[in-house]
């Protein structure tokens, strides 16, 4: 592959990494297999500046990030490490509730309106934003 | 030009191997992500797999995981997929097709002729 | 994984005539919902992607509508060429993009 050296039409550079917001919905594992298609994860949250971006593109609607724990620990998609990086949970959240009445509890993160966090059932239809980094050794995504 | 253009179908017996290319032109080849679709004889149409535009990631369908293997050469612009263990039920006209991604909604925009994979002793 | 249908298997129409074609999915899909003609021995071509959006080069005189579960594909005058046969698509499971099983349209 050859390095990635700007963004792609229709997406958003910011801190050397570039974003598409979707104004759609989808499950959580098809909102991370877009995202995989475009050579791209959904986005991985590393510091309170990139909260505040994310959160001012997202405006106040329940998004998709690339954070769950379906399969014990919570992980992020990149593999970048949970335990130590950023987080900005809601209140009592995550709670991996199982009162929603459709099976199993909370595995899948996203943002709530207010920009915090909350886990919620994978399967619920939200927007998604993916990100992929500049300067990477891989194609670009395809074009929009 | 835009085009697609499959190669490498024939017969082949129960368990053997097959490898499919596509051959690309007329748009920028590594800025899509890729498809093989097939069709049975008299049939209708059967997702097979996906690989991104750069390659580094692939999906299957549950019908041929383990056996097929998709892949890419974009200094080629060309597609392939690896078939392994070719049961009967593989005979085919396999198609590729490149994805197109609008707002969100995605959708198979250029096919190629396709060619046919008959599997039988 | 999603199951689309498609409750005509064929149908028999006019030169002029207005065909309406239906799809439904066995979940909502929201409008991911493509649709696409395919002709005796060649490859299928896209007609309509997102449920509504006409693709690039497609006569207007093809239309899709609908959301959720169920969808409806629309020749508003059925030409000699448009003779073929007709799926829909869904594209939700990103990439599981499973098909109907298609609907024939032939000369009445």
């Known amino acids: 592959g050859s390095e990635r050296t700007c963004c792609p039409v229709n997406w958003v550079e910011h801190e050397r990494s570039c974003y598409w917001f979707s104004r759609s919905g989808k499950a959580w594992a098809d909102a991370d297999n877009y995202c995989r298609l475009e050579d791209a994860h959904l986005v991985v949250v590393t510091s309170w500046e990139e909260q505040k971006f994310v959160q001012h593109h997202i405006g106040p609607v329940n998004t998709w990030m690339g954070l769950h724990d379906q399969n014990g620990p919570w992980k992020w998609v990149d593999g970048t490490d949970y335990e130590t990086g950023f987080k900005n949970w809601r209140p009592e959240q995550p709670d991996d509730w199982y009162g929603h009445g459709l099976g199993g509890g909370e595995d899948c993160a996203h943002f709530t309106d207010d920009g915090r966090w909350n886990d919620d059932v994978c399967q619920r239809p939200y927007r998604w934003v993916c990100e992929t980094e500049l300067d990477k050794a891989s194609q670009e995504p395809p074009l929009l | 030009e835009v085009q697609l253009l499959e190669s490498g179908g024939g017969l082949v017996q129960p368990g053997g191997s097959l490898r499919l290319s596509c051959a690309a032109s007329?748009?920028?080849?590594?800025?899509?992500?890729m498809n093989w679709v097939r069709q049975a004889p008299g049939k209708g149409l059967e997702w097979v797999s996906a690989?991104?535009?750069?390659?580094?990631?692939?999906f299957y369908a549950d019908s041929v995981k383990g056996r097929f293997t998709i892949s890419r050469d974009n200094s080629k612009n060309t597609l392939y997929l690896q078939m392994n263990g070719l049961r009967a039920e593989d005979t085919a006209v396999y198609y590729c097709?490149?994805?197109?991604?609008?707002?969100?909604?995605?959708?198979?925009?250029?096919w190629g002729q396709g060619t046919l994979v008959t599997v039988s002793s | 994984d999603i199951q689309m249908t498609q409750s005509q298997s064929s149908l028999s129409a006019s030169v002029g005539d207005r065909v309406t074609i239906t799809c439904r999915a066995s979940?909502?899909?929201?409008?991911?919902l493509n649709w696409y003609q395919q002709k005796p021995g060649k490859a299928p071509k896209l007609l309509i992607y997102?449920?509504?959006s006409l693709q690039s080069g497609v006569p207007s005189r093809f239309s899709g509508s609908g959301s959720g579960t169920d969808f409806t594909l629309t020749i508003s005058s059925l030409q000699p060429e448009d003779f073929a046969t007709y799926y829909c698509?869904?594209?939700?499971?990103?990439?599981?993009?499973?098909f109907g099983p298609g609907t024939k349209v032939d000369i009445k």
């Open positions: 097709a490149s994805r197109i991604a609008v707002a969100g909604s995605e959708a198979f925009a250029i």
């Open positions: 007329g748009f920028t080849f590594s800025n899509y992500a």
């Open positions: 690989i991104s535009g750069g390659g580094g990631n692939t």
């Open positions: 979940q909502s899909i929201a409008s991911y």
């Open positions: 997102g449920a509504s």
């Open positions: 698509q869904q594209s939700y499971s990103t990439p599981l993009f499973s």
